[in-house]
């Protein structure tokens, strides 16, 4: 791991209780094609172990969704951000579903050891737990 | 190539016959900006040559499409998966077009030498063959 | 930098004058989480400093947008391309908003030292300048 090849790909475990917009993730070969090489999970949230610039990517699909459903429940928004430590709290990536049922995006961002990433889904629709429809990952790119 | 820098970016060649949902890809500098460095094409499907974790990405745009077209003919769905060997067959990435005319996403996934990736477009709309609208690629990330 | 780890992530600075569809970008730690390690900005456009295959990614969100706004102002299109040198001018990546308010995609493409990338937003809607909604970046992947 000293090469700095930190990488993780997570699948959705569950959503939080009603007032908690966070998605809770899980990863590991026993679960399918998800994995953590370097980063760790802390109560379903992804914690970074190595400083550097990372490619962060996410796809979230809403469960049993049609464009009518999505527009009727608008606004449904997904935000990826650093949620702890509080001093580094910031939104990194934000998308609304509008009349679609899936959002997918990616970005490069500097992350530091100890940063915990949260993925907040606001709205009243549930995310699909299918592993090919909803996933979240990071890849270390450079120091 | 021994550094493990396997990478490929493909452009759409053609769709299959009516009952075959697979998209058939092509790549190489003579065709424009597509290329294969490591992976190979087998009858238009991408075959992996090196074990590792890969970033798989795809964008597909529907031909002469408006949001009316896209919603009228729902469901149009794109799935990327391992289609052979059969023992490793699995869907890796799935998106529906709903009221949009383009889907784009990416994910990290472990792939093994000999895995062949298929991209299945279900529905009765044609994918655009423009090279800036429809493309598919993989990038080796780590062992 | 000799390792070839060229990478940049930019945030929107401003749009061009009315007849100029280009988006003008900015980057640097003083601005937030944007940065340039290798590539440079030339009058708000990204210039490549090292030959190689790059992962290019972008997300653009339209300002104060609903699906009604987006469909009423259709077509709104985002194209990423090499705009100079003129001899290498080509569109690399193109997406329309249709009834959505955000586009996001990525692709692998060969770029050469001196290539300048332009991001053209056609239509009458303005892009959001929020750094978690609109961003553009490149990552060197291999020679």
């Amino acid at each position: 791991e000293s090469l700095g090849w930190d990488v993780a790909e997570l699948q959705l475990n569950h959503t939080g209780p009603q007032q908690d917009p966070r998605l809770y993730w899980q990863g590991g070969p026993a679960l399918g094609r998800s994995f953590l090489h370097g980063p760790e999970l802390d109560k379903g949230q992804l914690r970074i172990h190595r400083d550097g610039i990372y490619m962060v990517h996410i796809q979230v699909t809403l469960a049993i969704c049609s464009s009518t459903t999505a527009s009727r429940h608008h606004p449904t928004t997904l935000a990826v951000g650093i949620c702890s430590p509080a001093s580094r709290s910031i939104s990194l990536l934000r998308l609304s579903f509008h009349q679609g049922c899936t959002i997918a995006s990616q970005r490069l961002t500097p992350l530091a050891r100890g940063d915990t990433l949260c993925t907040n889904l606001t709205g009243t629709l549930l995310p699909s737990r299918n592993t090919d429809e909803t996933f979240f990952g990071v890849q270390w790119v450079r120091p | 190539e021994s550094l493990g820098w396997d990478v490929a970016e493909l452009q759409l060649n053609h769709t299959g016959p009516q009952q075959d949902p697979r998209l058939y890809w092509q790549g190489g500098p003579a065709l424009g900006r597509s290329f294969l460095h490591g992976p190979e094409l087998d009858k238009g499907q991408l075959r992996i040559h090196r074990d590792g974790i890969y970033m798989v990405h795809i964008q597909v745009t529907l031909a002469i499409c408006s949001s009316t077209t896209a919603s009228r003919h729902h469901p149009t769905t794109l799935a990327v998966g391992i289609c052979s060997p059969a023992s490793r067959s699995i869907s890796l990435l799935r998106l529906s077009f709903h009221q949009g005319c383009t889907i784009a996403s990416q994910r990290l996934t472990p792939l093994a030498r000999g895995d062949t990736l298929c991209t299945n477009l279900t529905g009765t709309l044609l994918p655009s063959r423009n090279t800036d609208e429809t493309f598919f690629g993989v990038q080796w990330v780590r062992p | 930098e000799s390792l070839g780890w060229d990478v940049a992530e930019l945030q929107l600075n401003h749009t061009g004058p009315q007849q100029d569809p280009r988006l003008y970008w900015q980057g640097g730690p003083a601005l937030g989480r944007s940065f340039l390690h290798g590539p440079e900005l030339d009058k708000g456009q990204l210039r490549i400093h090292r030959d190689g295959i790059y992962m290019v990614h972008i997300q653009v969100t339209l300002a104060i947008c609903s699906s009604t706004t987006a469909s009423r102002h259709h077509p709104t299109t985002l194209a990423v391309g090499i705009c100079s040198p003129a001899s290498r001018s080509i569109s690399l990546l193109r997406l329309s908003f249709h009834q959505g308010c955000t586009i996001a995609s990525q692709r692998l493409t060969p770029l050469a030292r001196g290539d300048t990338l332009c991001t053209n937003l056609t239509g009458t809607l303005l892009p959001s300048r929020n750094t978690d909604e609109t961003f553009f970046g490149v990552q060197w992947v291999r020679p």
Epitope: - | A63, I64, H73, R129 | -
Partner: antibody, heavy 120, light 111 residues
């Protein structure tokens, strides 16, 4: 086998309206758009519009807006076209047609046509 | 609307020879990497029959003596070798945008 069976010939007076039918069989009616095409005697073909029985989505050629109204009855797998304020210019054979496998406006299956004659 | 102009309006071709029908569009009907031009055959008292779709694809069940070519604005339908049963009127049609339009037709007579 896909079949589009159209209603019989009509002789109508100027100013009247008429509703012709196109009964589909051999496929799932709600899966395919039905298009309507006009052909005046000894002349070429003109696209009138389409209807998607799945959700009654319609599109009309500007030239036929206000002249033609497209509807369908899912229970009987039948598409209808109503023509109003008929004049001699509306005398023609009217065809219903179904798209091919791909969902674009080219026409793989046709009805036999309904001949409309407008005459006092 | 896109205007399609067919030529000639009529032609007579000997049995076994080649018939060539031209269709010219007022603007390009190519888009998204496809050419949205189609060809039909219509015999007297019958509905049109699809022969060729997307400029060059033969519809199922259509004999291989029919072929289509062209891109952009200029298109050709070839019939070779012509047979007696090919006597009919031939129409080109585009589906590049709404409304789809048809050419004026070319009447083929077999000598």
């Amino acid at each position: 086998e896909v079949q589009l069976q159209q209603s019989g010939p009509e002789l109508v007076k100027p100013g009247a309206s008429l509703k012709m039918s196109c009964k589909a069989s051999g496929y799932t009616f709600t899966d395919y758009v039905i298009h309507w095409v006009k052909q005046k005697p000894g002349q070429g073909l003109e696209w009138i519009g389409y209807l998607h029985p799945y959700n009654d989505d319609t599109k009309y050629n500007e030239k036929f807006k206000g002249k033609a109204t497209l509807t369908s009855d899912k229970s009987s797998s039948t598409a209808y076209m109503e023509l109003n304020s008929l004049t001699s210019e509306d005398s023609a054979v009217y065809y219903c047609a179904r798209r091919g496998y791909y969902d674009y406006a080219w026409f793989a299956d046709w009805g036999q046509g309904t001949l409309v004659t407008v005459s006092a | 609307d896109i205007v399609l102009t067919q030529s000639p309006a009529s032609l007579a071709v000997s049995l076994g020879q080649r018939a060539t029908i031209s269709c010219k569009a007022s603007k390009s009907v190519s888009a998204s990497g496809y050419t949205w031009m189609h060809w039909y055959q219509q015999k007297p008292g019958q509905a049109p029959k699809l022969l060729i779709y997307l400029a060059s694809n033969l519809e199922s069940g259509v004999p291989a003596r029919f072929s289509g070519s062209g891109s952009g604005t200029d298109f050709t339908l070839n019939i070779h070798p012509v047979e007696e049963e090919d006597a009919a009127t031939y129409y080109c049609q585009h589906s590049r945008e709404l409304p789809p339009t048809f050419g004026g037709g070319t009447k083929l007579e077999i000598k």
